[in-house]
């Protein structure tokens, strides 16, 4: 019989008492085969974290700073359930730490030195740890003691709870630095008042502070937010302009064997019986003998944290950077205007080898990081382990939802001004063998299908989006008799045709021979009835252009396109017979790396781009033996995006809507995790 007990960790007598009451009340409402609670008492949250890591307890609820401690080795805990605030219809699990300024003050984030600052309190998240952590490497040396460095950075501050004797500048704007509401500039509202009164130039608070203090929109319009990219935005655009997005209060558990499903089952049932306004006898979110015992009194319920989400992703790059800076206190030798090497994310061995070759030839400008899937790469770029990669439009969508931005687009047509002219896109097509003459767009049911990969544009999002509109369900593996769609569940019929050996079967990388455009076409040649690819795929792999044994004798004339009106056309008539126009592949990065990635890639393509005439004697960025490694092989250049610099603008309304419609069919665990952070 599996043990269905969750050992909850309590950090005080009062918490232990509430925990026992929680245990007893759960017993009375949950059947004997359901989850149960046991209580473990420890002296502190850090002791609880250690106890969970050592398998002496299973769960505890923590503030963001402690979630960071819990994630660090050797603890390796992960977030499993989040408390939410507000309503069930619009649950808030995060708040945003922001820097508020008056509209008429003309400075940006990188010009804060010498300004006057208002903080909620020393050591508090939004008011101190996050802003000072992010500014840490700009502080004058020596950076220890921190208070002295901060005092020397700003021209005056109000940082309640600071030592006014040792650091008088930190109390210059609020004499005495009182650590309670007796100090008019204490806390969120106090720090905002410090700005409003004109005492300070910037207030470090949370996004809701300004709304709680200024009910009138006209009054709010006198203020702006400072963004990390050295721009400003209106105060209601905090989701796109903040210092960090911070989880409010989170249940953590072990990463391996952590009982996360059981913990969720327990808390979900607990909120049903003892949540807000559920029971008089016992209330989960109430603390008669104290404050915020086990859970925050202000919580309204729980949400399950998506399983793909580790602590780094949950806390977010900015928060982790801020806290790491404060804890580790390490900065580059001397901050220079020079760009650090760009860490390129490479998929599997083939891409890594090409990336390493690029790295050697780039003379230190490019470094390489490996991952097994595109989603793993996106996650690495999000958390700073990698910086950039080039992505198909379907993954540009996922990356965009995860906060990354497109920075350059692949262009596939030769033109005089390639780098300045991003193209409209390429065509997604459905290819069949000419010999299968009865096959049309209208009778594909039961046929064998070949896809570049799940989640990619031409191979999946466009054809499956069109198919979904027709069949109104997501069971594509039942629509086709079998197929190869790398990235599908291994037991799906859409992995049956794949050719990868062992664990590589149906993997969405080059270890699966039927992966990508060339792979999907090969799947059609060898096993399938229809391949969903780009309009250039057939000509690029026929007429001797691909020397591989399976392709070298293929003839373009032996293949035709399926048109949406039920007719068929020759391959060269793609402009009048395609499924949709697809946005070109694009390079994505984090917002903070945008300028450097842009600069270094422009340099790199001038050295190794299509101006290189002899690829047998020189490194060529846009060529690869096993097809489309790092970039599409037909890339002519990487083009500026001009104003199409967000994923929505880059992909276009129509494509974003199409992928959005297909979201209900999505199996992307990363997309689920990212939409948890930003619904």
């Amino acid at each position: 019989v599996p043990d269905k007990t969750v050992r909850w960790c309590a950090v005080s007598e009062h918490e232990a008492t509430k925990c026992q009451s929680f245990r007893d009340h759960m017993k009375s409402v949950i059947p004997s085969d359901g989850p149960s609670v046991a209580c473990v008492k420890k002296a502190s949250y850090l002791d609880c974290i250690r106890a969970i890591a050592a398998n002496e307890a299973d769960a505890v609820t923590l503030d963001a700073g402690l979630v960071y401690d819990a994630y660090l080795a050797p603890n390796n805990l992960k977030p499993v359930v989040a408390e939410f605030y507000g309503s069930k219809e619009d649950p808030q699990t995060f708040y945003y730490a922001v820097a508020v300024v008056k509209k008429d003050s003309g400075f940006q984030m990188n010009q804060l030195r010498g300004k006057k600052s208002c903080h909620t309190g020393l050591g508090r998240s939004a008011g101190w740890n996050i802003p000072i952590g992010l500014l840490y490497c700009d502080l004058p040396e020596p950076r220890k003691p921190l208070e002295k460095a901060v005092a020397n950075f700003f021209s005056g501050s109000c940082a309640p709870c600071a030592d006014g004797t040792d650091f008088p500048q930190l109390c210059q704007l609020c004499p005495g630095c009182g650590c309670s509401t007796l100090n008019q500039y204490f806390g969120y509202s106090g720090a905002f008042k410090c700005l409003k009164d004109g005492a300070g130039d910037v207030a470090f608070v949370k996004h809701s502070t300004i709304f709680e203090n200024l009910a009138n929109k006209a009054d709010r319009d006198q203020y702006e937010l400072l963004c990390l990219d050295n721009t400003r935005k209106p105060v209601d655009e905090y989701k796109d302009c903040h210092l960090a997005q911070v989880p409010s209060h989170t249940v953590v558990a072990r990463s391996m064997g952590g009982k996360e499903d059981l913990i969720w089952e327990l808390l979900n049932q607990a909120q049903e019986h003892f949540g807000k306004d559920k029971s008089k006898e016992f209330q989960l979110f109430s603390s008669p003998h104290g404050k915020d015992l086990l859970f925050k009194d202000s919580a309204h319920g729980f949400l399950k944290v998506p399983p793909r989400m580790d602590a780094k992703m949950y806390l977010g790059y900015e928060y982790v950077t801020a806290i790491r800076n404060l804890r580790e206190g390490t900065c580059p030798e001397a901050p220079t205007d020079e760009c650090k090497p760009v860490k390129w994310c490479a998929l599997s061995h083939h891409e890594r080898l090409k990336c390493d070759e690029w790295s050697v030839n780039s003379v230190g400008k490019i470094e390489c990081v490996s991952a097994e899937t595109t989603e793993d790469c996106i996650a690495k770029i999000m958390n700073g382990e990698a910086d950039a990669m080039s992505l198909d439009g379907g993954f540009v969508y996922i990356a965009g939802k995860c906060g990354l931005v497109p920075v350059l687009a692949e262009n596939y047509n030769k033109s005089d001004n390639c780098e300045d002219t991003p193209e409209a896109g390429y065509f997604a097509i459905a290819v069949v063998k000419k010999s299968a003459s009865d096959l049309t767009w209208d009778n594909l049911k039961g046929k064998k299908s070949c896809h570049t990969a799940v989640g990619r544009t031409a191979g999946w999002n466009i054809p499956m989006g069109l198919l979904y509109n027709k069949i109104n369900h997501c069971r594509f593996d039942e629509f086709f008799s079998e197929g190869c769609a790398p990235g599908s569940k291994k037991d799906s019929s859409l992995c049956k045709l794949c050719m990868g050996s062992g664990l590589n079967l149906c993997e969405p990388n080059n270890k699966e021979g039927y992966y990508g455009y060339t792979g999907a076409f090969r799947c059609l040649v060898e096993k399938g009835d229809v391949a969903f690819v780009k309009h250039q795929t057939v000509p690029q792999n026929t007429g001797g252009k691909n020397p591989d044994p399976w392709a070298k004798n293929l003839n373009e004339k032996d293949y035709e396109l399926l048109c949406l009106d039920g007719t068929r056309k020759p391959v060269e008539e793609y402009a009048n017979c395609h499924l949709a126009r697809a946005p070109n592949h694009a390079v994505v990065t984090r917002k903070d790396k945008e300028a450097c990635v842009h600069k270094i890639l422009r340099q790199q393509q001038h050295l190794f781009g299509s101006n290189v005439t002899d690829c047998s004697g020189n490194f060529c960025l846009f060529r690869s033996e096993t097809k489309d490694l790092l970039f599409r092989d037909d890339t002519v250049c990487l083009a500026k995006l001009h104003d199409r610099n967000t994923y929505e603008k880059y992909l276009g309304e129509e494509y974003v809507k199409a992928v959005g419609n297909l979201r209900k069919c999505s199996t992307s665990s990363l997309l689920e995790a990212c939409t948890f952070r930003r619904p």
Partner: nanobody, 112 residues
């Protein structure tokens, strides 16, 4: 001007071993890494192995576990130890570092 000279090639039976060396004249050799390539008759030149300045190495899939690349900066030399040689390993082997043209290469023939 740095020049690269490859040596150590020869005729060897399948299963045999060879050790290729790449010696550079001049200073600053291999500061950004060194790559061994090979070219079989009528085929494209292909990357075999590389070693970066920090000692990181990588290999094409077909030679992994059989070939080992190493370096001795004091001697301005990079080696390619090739074991369990197969007929498909036949070709001219070249070493390369950024900014330096290809040398003459050294011929490796694996045949019984």
């Amino acid at each position: 001007q740095v020049q690269l000279v490859e040596s150590g090639g020869g005729l060897v039976q399948p299963g045999g071993s060879l050790r290729l060396s790449c010696v550079a004249s001049g200073s600053g050799f291999g500061i950004n890494g060194v790559i061994w390539y090979r070219q079989a008759p009528g085929k494209q030149r292909e990357l075999v192995a590389l070693i970066k300045s920090d000692g990181y190495t990588n290999y094409r899939e077909s030679v992994k576990g059989r070939f080992t690349i190493s370096r001795d900066d004091a001697k301005n030399t990079v080696w390619l130890q090739m074991n369990a040689l197969e007929p498909e390993d036949t070709g001219v082997y070249y070493c390369k570092t950024p900014g330096v043209p290809f040398g003459q290469g050294t011929q490796v023939t694996v045949s019984s």
